[in-house]
Interface confidence: low
């Protein structure tokens, strides 16, 4: 669920999930439209699509939690039910993507107005 994602983002990127990524660009946080603004925003775009595929399969992406381990910078999704494991996999891809794009993180997009996304 969202709490799992929050903790995973913070462990991997070292940044506060809500303030740094909750409103970033056009796709980080709730909803999404238009063209992603940069690499970080593309990570969130891909994550939205990953979640979309799971929703199509009946997974409750907002509420279903999962178990993962974090050691030496590596996230490992624990075995479990289909929805939980695949939800963890979506989040794992996102956080690694966010970490790869930390250098290009642009504070100008941190609280980007959705109305400017087209």
């Amino acid at each position: 669920g969202l709490l799992d994602l929050k903790s995973m983002i913070e462990k991997v990127t070292g940044k506060n999930a809500l303030t740094n990524y909750g409103f970033y660009g056009c796709y980080c946080g709730w909803g999404g439209r238009g063209t992603p603004k940069d690499g970080t925003d593309w990570c969130c775009w891909a994550h939205d699509h990953c979640y979309g595929r799971l929703e199509e399969k009946g997974c409750n992406i907002r509420t279903q939690s999962y178990k993962y381990r974090f050691a030496w910078g590596v996230v490992t999704c624990e075995p479990g039910p289909f929805c939980h494991v695949n939800l963890c996999a979506c989040d794992r891809k996102l956080v690694y993507c966010l970490k790869r794009n930390l250098r290009s993180y642009n504070p100008q997009y941190q609280y980007f107005p959705n109305i400017l996304c087209s």
Epitope: E55, E56, K57, G58, N60, R62, T63, Q64, P79, G80, P81, F82, C83, H84, V85
Partner: antibody, heavy 116, light 106 residues
Framework: QVQLQQSGPELVKPGASVKMSCKAS????????ITWVKQRTGQGLEWIGE????????YYDEKFKGKATLTADKSSNTAYMQLSSMTSEDSAVYFC?????????WGQGTTLTVSS | QIVLTQSPAIMSASPGEKVTISCSAS?????MYWYQQKPGSSPKPWIY???NLASGVPARFSGSGSGTSYSLTISSMEAEDAATYYC?????????FGAGTKLELK
Amino acid sequence: QVQLQQSGPELVKPGASVKMSCKASGYTFTDYVITWVKQRTGQGLEWIGEIYPGSGSTYYDEKFKGKATLTADKSSNTAYMQLSSMTSEDSAVYFCARWFPYFDYWGQGTTLTVSS
Amino acid sequence: QIVLTQSPAIMSASPGEKVTISCSASSSVSYMYWYQQKPGSSPKPWIYRTSNLASGVPARFSGSGSGTSYSLTISSMEAEDAATYYCQQYHSYPLTFGAGTKLELK
């Protein structure tokens, strides 16, 4: 069209094991979860567990851990359920069903009778 | 695990009558799913994600609810609606079903 064809009725002795099958057709087998459900005569539906054929990952209700083993053969598009250490409590109809995004297709059921 | 309690367990309705079957969850769930089963047959998907009718389900059926309280409604009972209806949750594991409501034609 999508079909789940289950194997025929089984009569087994107490203590024995049985393996039933669920052959899928009409869709990409590895893309959907297959779930198994138990229904005793005149009773309701009980979820046993699920398998995701794409990866082979499984999940079971605690009640059926050690009783049921779910497997899938991607080459034949077939899911299997093995039940071990049979007792009279295992006598039931067992259904396989596909999940997307609900149990949209069901097999016709396999009737299992445990009797000496 | 989440326990689903259906009520009533058995009911009968006359043709044209409005029917409501309830399903109460022991803790909050995101969606409820409903299946219809007739004797000697496999269950059929009936309503998914609380209010969406599965393919081929007549428009006289509807589903509603949120949190711990859900229901299936038939606006006008017909003979072919006589069956057992099960609610089911996929909110958390293990997946659970209600005990079923047997709907008979009066």
